[in-house]
C-alpha cells in the first residue's frame, strides 16, 4: 500500500483490480442509455478529465525513481471518476438497469482508490469535477464521453500496475 | 421488489415545519436519485425536485427553493423532505418517486390548519 | 418552462373503444415524454417512457407515440378499469413539468 512514508503499493492486486477496471469500462460503454446519441452536449464535464502525462512520472524510469508521483496522480484520476460516476450524469434518468456494469465499475473504481490511499493517508486531490446539475437530455452523451475517457485513463493505469507487478514487487 | 415506504400523514399549524420520510428497499439505494412531487387535493402534479443519495447533491425547482429541503440517509436507504413556513397551499399530498418514475411511494399527506 | 398541454380534458368512452390521447410540448423534448395513470386515490402509475417504450406490468393495449413536440397515448380497446386521469410529463430538462390531465370516463 503506498503509505505516507512512500513505500510501494500492493502491485498485484492492483494489477488485477485495474485489469478488472478494464474489463468494466469497456462492458459498460454501449450500455449507457436509451436511444442514439442525437443531441449534442454540454463539453463542460468532460474537457477537464485527468489524463496521465509524460511529466507525472509513469513511465518505467519515473517508476523506478519514485512511483508516488504517478499513483498519486492515479489516484486524483480515480477518485475524480468515482465522483463522475456516482453523479446524476449516472445516477439520474434515464435510469440505468440495475445490473448495469456502471454500478461495478463504480465500486471498483473506490476499492483500487483505497487500495492506493489507505485509512489516515491523503494525497492532495486537486480535479474534483463539477457537481451542478446535468439537464436530462445532455447524459447519455455525456455518459459516453466520460465513459469513454475512462477506458483511455484505466488503460494506462494498468499498464502502469503490470509494470509495477513485474518489475518493482518485492 | 422495490418499494418505497412514505411516513404517515401530517397535520401541521400555519408557519410550522414538517418533515417526512420515504424508505426504500428492494435496490441499491445510492444508485438513483429520489424524485419528489406534489399534488394539490383534486389537482395536477408538480416536480419539486430530487436528491442524489450518493452525494447528497439535491437539484430543486426553483419554485420550491426555500420551501422544501431535500436529504438522504444510506444508512437507513432513506430519503426525507422538509417543508417549512407552511400555508395553506402548502396541504397536498407529496409522492417519492425513484427509478425513471416507474416505482412511486403511497404519498404523504400534510395538512395545513389553524 | 416546458409547458405541457393535453386535450381533452376529459374524454367520455365505451369499453372496447381505441382512444387517443393528446399532449403538447411547448418546445421539442425529443423522446423523453412519460405517461402515467392515477387512479382516484392512488399514487400516479408510470404506462410509458420515454415515448413509446413500454413498462413491465403494464397491459399491452397502451401504447406511445410521438417525437419533437407532440405525443399520443393510445389504448387500443378500453376496460372499465381504465377510468382515471392520464398525465404526461416532460422529461427533457428541468424543471420537469406535467401536463393538466385527460380524465378517462366510462359511458
Known amino acids: 500500500r503506498a503509505v505516507p512514508g512512500g513505500s510501494s503499493p500492493a502491485w498485484t492486486q492492483c494489477q488485477q483490480l485495474s485489469q478488472k477496471l478494464c474489463t468494466l469500462a469497456w462492458s459498460a460503454h454501449p450500455l449507457v442509455g436509451h436511444m442514439d446519441l442525437r443531441e449534442e452536449g454540454d463539453e463542460e464535464t468532460t474537457n477537464d478529465v485527468p489524463h496521465i502525462q509524460c511529466g507525472d512520472g509513469c513511465d518505467p524510469q519515473g517508476l523506478r525513481d519514485n512511483s508516488q508521483f504517478c499513483l498519486q496522480r492515479i489516484h486524483q484520476g480515480l477518485i475524480f471518476y468515482e465522483k463522475l460516476l456516482g453523479s446524476d450524469i449516472f445516477t439520474g434518468e434515464p435510469s440505468l438497469l440495475p445490473d448495469s456494469p456502471v454500478g461495478q465499475l463504480h465500486a471498483s473504481l473506490l476499492g483500487l482508490s483505497q487500495l492506493l490511499q489507505p485509512e489516515g493517508h491523503h494525497w492532495e486531490t486537486q480535479q474534483i469535477p463539477s457537481l451542478s446539475p446535468s439537464q436530462p437530455w445532455q447524459r447519455l452523451l455525456l455518459r459516453f464521453k466520460i465513459l469513454r475517457s475512462l477506458q483511455a485513463f484505466v488503460a494506462v493505469a494498468a499498464r502502469v500496475f503490470a509494470h509495477g507487478a513485474a518489475t518493482l514487487s518485492p | 421488489e422495490v418499494q418505497l415506504q412514505q411516513s404517515g400523514p401530517e397535520l401541521v399549524k400555519p408557519g410550522a415545519s414538517v418533515k417526512m420520510s420515504c424508505k426504500a428497499s428492494?435496490?441499491?439505494?445510492?444508485?438513483?436519485?429520489m424524485h419528489w412531487v406534489k399534488q394539490k387535493p383534486g389537482q395536477g402534479l408538480e416536480w419539486i425536485g430530487y436528491?442524489?443519495?450518493?452525494?447528497?447533491?439535491?437539484n430543486y425547482n426553483e419554485n420550491f427553493k426555500g420551501k422544501a429541503t431535500l436529504t438522504s440517509d444510506k444508512s437507513s436507504s432513506t430519503a426525507s423532505m422538509e417543508l417549512s413556513s407552511l400555508t395553506s397551499e402548502d396541504s397536498a399530498v407529496y409522492y417519492c418517486a425513484v427509478w425513471d418514475f416507474t416505482y412511486w411511494g403511497q404519498g404523504t399527506l400534510v395538512t395545513v390548519s389553524a | 418552462d416546458i409547458v405541457m398541454t393535453q386535450s381533452p380534458a376529459t374524454l367520455s368512452v365505451t369499453p372496447g373503444d381505441r382512444v387517443s390521447l393528446s399532449c403538447r410540448a411547448s418546445?421539442?423534448?425529443?423522446?423523453?415524454l412519460y405517461w402515467y395513470q392515477q387512479k382516484s386515490h392512488e399514487s400516479p402509475r408510470l404506462l410509458i417512457k420515454?415515448?413509446?417504450q413500454s413498462i413491465s406490468g403494464i397491459p399491452s393495449r397502451f401504447s406511445g407515440s410521438g417525437s419533437g413536440s407532440d405525443f399520443t397515448l393510445s389504448i387500443n380497446s378500453v376496460e372499465p378499469e381504465d377510468v382515471g386521469v392520464y398525465y404526461c410529463?416532460?422529461?427533457?430538462?428541468?424543471?420537469?413539468?406535467f401536463g393538466g390531465g385527460t380524465k378517462l370516463e366510462i359511458k
Open positions: 428492494g435496490y441499491t439505494f445510492t444508485r438513483y436519485v
Open positions: 410529463q416532460n422529461g427533457h430538462s428541468f424543471p420537469y413539468t
Open positions: 436528491i442524489n443519495p450518493y452525494n447528497d447533491v439535491p
Open positions: 418546445q421539442r423534448i425529443s423522446d423523453y
Open positions: 420515454y415515448a413509446s
